[in-house]
Amino acid sequence: DSSKWVFEHPETLYAWEGACVWIPCTYRALDGDLESFILFHNPEYNKNTSKFDGTRLYESTKDGKVPSEQKRVQFLGDKNKNCTLSIHPVHLNDSGQLGLRMESKTEKWMERIHLNVSERPFPPHIQLPPEIQESQEVTLTCLLNFSCYGYPIQLQWLLEGVPMRQAAVTSTSLTIKSVFTRSELKFSPQWSHHGKIVTCQLQDADGKFLSNDTVQLNVKHTPKLEIKVTPSDAIVREGDSVTMTCEVSSSNPEYTTVSWLKDGTSLKKQNTFTLNLREVTKDQSGKYCCQVSNDVGPGRSEEVFLQVQYAPEPSTVQILHSPAVEGSQVEFLCMSLANPLPTNYTWYHNGKEMQGRTEEKVHIPKILPWHAGTYSCVAENILGTGQRGPGAELDVQYPPKKVTTVIQNPMPIREGDTVTLSCNYNSSNPSVTRYEWKPHGAWEEPSLGVLKIQNVGWDNTTIACAACNSWCSWASPVALNVQYAPRDVRVRKIKPLSEIHSGNSVSLQCDFSSSHPKEVQFFWEKNGRLLGKESQLNFDSISPEDAGSYSCWVNNSIGQTASKAWTLEVLYAPRRLRVSMSPGDQVMEGKSATLTCESDANPPVSHYTWFDWNNQSLPYHSQKLRLEPVKVQHSGAYWCQGTNSVGKGRSPLSTLTVYYSPETIGRR
């Protein structure tokens, strides 16, 4: 049953004289193993014999023996699956039909395979994509319907006869579906590859040429342009003429439109291959190119930089930074459009040339107030000298300078006067906006920079002011030199150091703490009576009569100041003692008689002693001696003695007469 045999193999195999053929082949004999195999060349069925006639290239028998002449052909198969064959070498006359006669126990089959052997190696075939565009990667394929294990070959790519640098990937197929060798080359064609010949060359293992295929590249690309300019350096002066020509060196497909661009912007009404610029101005400086389009897209030429040279334009000055603070650094930049760029600069400050400053930038490392003003510059190039522009103003800011505190009053200033001071300065930038004063006080500022001190104190010594803008500058303090009457006048005892005793030498000092002016006069006074005009008041031998309330006065040209009253106390022993009797020195018996010891003493008498006419001390120690009732025998002379811390004093005798009462006389 023929349907039971299933074969798979390439339909036709290709080779050339001297090469080899490898025939991949599989089969399936469903009724059992293969028992006999014969390979025929161009088999023909003989109906008479019911057998195939033809050249037998290979024959296998049941005992597996193969005739020696059949070594050229090899059956590489097996008894149930594989029917692969190899013919090595293959000859031209091997072309035709190969017949595989297969016999199993019960079935037979003839499988036919076509073999095409050429006299010389046949060429490979180059396959190209339908369209090639510049810079787009394409894959070139070189295909050869040949591959054989016993005959190695290689495929090499050439461009215009020169091996291509790109690495090709070669693959082979020896399968029941196909037999081929293929080389694939990835390649990014440039416009310059258009029309170039690409070759795929078949070589043997030694690199010997066998055959090739060639194709001409058709690379689609935008127009390729060349721009030519007169003059060739594209450097002209204002008023000159310039011609630019656009040449198309290649375009595939043909170009359709032409235009010109300046600095990337299309120039209107310029649609020819020549651009004529007459009497150019500096504004026409720039980058020019031509643009030509085809179906692929627009192509642009290289840019031509047209330089229209001109003398420097009026310059401007840029200041970094204004306003500037005194002591900071400042940079000036001279800006002037010119072509070529200026080579020399002249700088001016307030109209005067700044010597030695010839560069685009001027640097002042430490700004001073007199750097303020207008800075201008002039730029110069080979075509001429520009004009001086308006310049830029440098504002130099600094604290108020030379600040002084000025006393507006006529001198001298007296304590209690109203003093007016002003805060003056030489210059300031920005303007002074406020003032400060030291020391602080509850003082009036009637106007900016003026200080009014009402009722100036004697101790207002110095005042300083500051004038302030963004900074404060302090003046040196000014002395008010306030004049005042002597202060803190007081009486001070110089000697003796202890209490004053009658007879002592005594000195009193008139002290004061301060006086301005310093020249002073002194006056001593007791009970409104002038005693002296020296700073000291001296007593050679003080007496109790000198005790009392003393004041001293100190005066200067401003006024006089009195001390507080000072009490002078003289200590002395009891004196001027006398015994006084009450109600009198004649008293009737039985009545009351009081004897008083009167004295003058400082300190007062602390202890009294009474004596009778016999100089007998009496047992009484108080100032008063009371006799009640008085007796006649009390009559007699009495005296007293007073004692204080200084000493003792005694009185003269005083006689008390006690007379009888009428009753006593009546009784007698």
Epitope: G356, R357, H363, L368, P369, H371
Partner: antibody, heavy 117, light 107 residues
């Protein structure tokens, strides 16, 4: 710290030339002008010339024909060269720093030059 | 060239006193005037620039004034360390010129 230091030969023979180097530190020669000033013994100060920040020079007309000032920015040095020295060129030579609008704020210590055979 | 004239070559002043040194320019110098102090054996030292601007570190007893062509350096309360020669210099235009100097001595 700003410093200027002059180095000179000390003794020069009459009719010979004088070369002095001023080496500066603490500032750049492209930011400050350098002047040369001399002071004969017991006499006053005399300005000889200046090297401006931009590299230009200016000379006292009395010395124009025999004076040249140059500099080497990379070494921070300014050079004075004076030809045809006579005995009355004996002086202390100072290099000093200034800038536009400023006075001469820093002076070298001076180098003493004696012209004698 | 602008000529700078210092009328006094020598000045003798008492300690603590006030001294005024004058300098006259042959042309207007727009206040671009400097004063220098030179002590024996030393390089000059800048005291005042721009006619009035006191350099940092210079005692406040030094002051400058003037305008146009006439300029003054004042020292109040003279100290022993102020004994020196004082030079004026114009920095208005080249050649920069100096005054002949005023030597200050203590009386």
């Amino acid at each position: 710290e700003v410093q200027l230091e002059e180095s000179g030969p000390g003794l020069v023979a009459p009719s010979q030339s004088l070369s002095i180097t001023c080496t500066v530190s603490g500032f750049s020669l492209t930011r400050y002008d350098i002047s040369w000033i001399r002071q004969p013994p017991g006499k006053g100060l005399e300005w000889l010339g200046v090297m401006w920040t931009g590299g230009g020079t200016n000379y006292n007309s009395a010395f124009m024909s025999r004076l040249s000032i140059s500099r080497d920015n990379s070494k921070s040095q300014v050079f004075l060269k004076m030809n045809s020295l006579q005995t009355d060129d004996t002086a202390i030579y100072y290099c000093v720093r200034s800038y536009y609008g400023s006075a001469m704020d820093y002076w070298g210590q001076g180098t003493s030059v004696t012209v004698s055979s | 060239d602008i000529v700078m004239t210092q009328s006094s070559s020598y000045l003798s002043v008492s300690l603590g006193g006030r001294v005024t040194i004058t300098c006259k320019a042959s042309d207007h110098i727009n206040n671009w005037l400097a004063w220098y102090q030179q002590k024996p054996g030393n390089a000059p030292r800048l005291l005042i620039s721009g006619a009035t601007s006191l350099e940092t570190g210079v005692p406040s007893r030094f002051s400058g004034s003037g305008s146009g062509k006439d300029y003054t350096l004042s020292i109040t309360s003279l100290q022993t360390e102020d004994v020196a020669t004082y030079y004026c210099q114009q920095h208005w235009s080249t050649p920069f010129t100096f005054g002949s100097g005023t030597k200050l001595e203590i009386k």
